[in-house]
């Protein structure tokens, strides 16, 4: 069974990575984002189901894209390079979800773009901290 | 169905520079990630860089900067790699192929393909 | 740099045959790992993506499999055009690697 402390760590991992994917989407957002259009024609694949932490592996899936659109926005718009910015989260997502288990993600049909696909894993990291505390 | 066509085969002397192109047909090249990739004879393949033919951003891998450049040209869909001070090891079968994350996730990886150019590099 | 080691070097295996060959990473690199199959004097060909996804137009008999960081091609029963050299390609991080190949040769 989880331990208090090892719930809490898990919490906070969620926390940082909700931070981490906020701060992505407002940057994407800011007005004064040139590549916008051409962001939003990029294709993001959703999960089927992201009910548990091991669902993280189709979000993992789907950094290297995320850190492609990224290059195309102006660096001030974030306060770290893509690279790092991903790398950041990488470690933070198979802390998360492990890397023991190989889980196979099942994707939706339908395609996202950056902006859905953000919020559907901020809406994510929200409902599990939620469960948590 | 997208198609690249490589420049021909090209003989070079060592200390030259040699620039190959890839046409893409079929679709628009900013739909795509320009890669180059080459083989040297009986060899493995090696990653030598890429271009966002959009902005013309680059990546190269570090055995190659400061010797290659990657260029495209959107007004007719051709993306080319250029290679300086050449050596006897830069013999080898170059590639272009693509990556792109407007389609379907096959298309993220090394799905199309040149034919390839034979480049001899010899004194 | 990401270091993917194929194995074996050579397999020598006679048609109907299954083969099975191994991709390991020299570190984590989660299903961003393709397989690729390459004839002599052709580019090489999309077989497999995200470790395990076959890639359109590839017969079923190629599949693919993940543990850890270790990666398996696996080829259920060989036909005559199946002999060729196989390599893996990491696209977790660039510079993107590959691995050394492996050839498959009729026994």
């Known amino acids: 069974a989880p331990t208090s402390s090892s719930t809490k760590k898990t919490q906070l991992q969620l926390e940082h990575l909700l931070l981490d994917l906020q701060m992505i989407l407002n940057g994407i957002n800011n007005y004064k984002n040139p590549k916008l259009t051409r962001m939003l024609t990029f294709k993001f694949y959703m999960p089927k189901k992201a009910t548990e932490l091991k669902h993280l592996q189709c979000l993992e899936e789907e950094l290297g894209p995320l850190e492609e659109v990224l290059n195309l926005a102006q660096s001030k718009n974030f306060h770290l390079r893509p690279r790092d910015l991903i790398s950041n989260i990488r470690v933070i997502v198979l802390e998360l979800k492990g890397s023991e288990t190989t889980f196979m993600c099942e994707y939706a049909d339908e395609t996202a773009t950056i902006v859905e696909f953000l919020n559907r894993w901020i809406t994510f990291c929200q409902s599990i901290i939620s469960t948590l505390t | 169905q997208v198609q690249l066509v490589q420049s021909g085969a090209e003989v070079k002397k060592p200390g030259a520079t040699v620039k190959i192109s890839c046409k893409v047909s079929?679709?628009?090249?900013?739909?795509?990630?320009m890669h180059w990739v080459r083989q040297a004879p009986g060899q493995g393949l090696e990653w030598i860089g890429r271009?966002?033919?959009?902005?013309?951003?680059?990546k190269y891998a570090e055995n190659f900067k400061g010797r290659v450049t990657i260029t495209a040209d959107t007004s007719t869909d051709t993306a080319y790699m250029e290679l300086s001070s050449l050596r006897s090891e830069d013999t080898a079968v170059y590639y272009c192929?693509?990556?792109?994350?407007?389609?379907?996730?096959?298309?993220?990886?090394?799905?199309?393909w040149g034919q390839g150019t034979l480049v001899t590099v010899s004194s | 740099d990401i270091v993917l080691t194929q194995s074996p070097a050579t397999l020598s295996l006679s048609p109907g045959e299954r083969a099975t060959l191994s991709c390991q990473a020299s570190?984590?690199?989660?299903?961003?790992l393709s397989w690729y199959q390459q004839k002599p004097g052709q580019a090489p060909r999309l077989l497999i993506y995200?470790?395990?996804s076959l890639a359109s137009g590839i017969p079923a008999r190629f599949s693919g499999s993940r543990s850890g960081t270790d990666f398996t091609l696996t080829i259920s029963s060989l036909e005559p055009e199946d002999f060729a050299v196989y390599y893996c390609?990491?696209?977790?991080?660039?510079?993107?690697?590959f691995g050394q190949g492996t050839k498959l040769e009729i026994k």
């Open positions: 570190q984590y690199i989660s299903n961003y």
């Open positions: 192929t693509t990556i792109t994350f407007l389609y379907s996730r096959e298309l993220r990886w090394f799905a199309y």
């Open positions: 271009i966002d033919p959009d902005d013309d951003s680059t």
């Open positions: 995200s470790a395990t």
């Open positions: 390609l990491q696209h977790y991080s660039t510079p993107y690697t």
């Open positions: 079929g679709d628009t090249i900013t739909a795509y990630y």
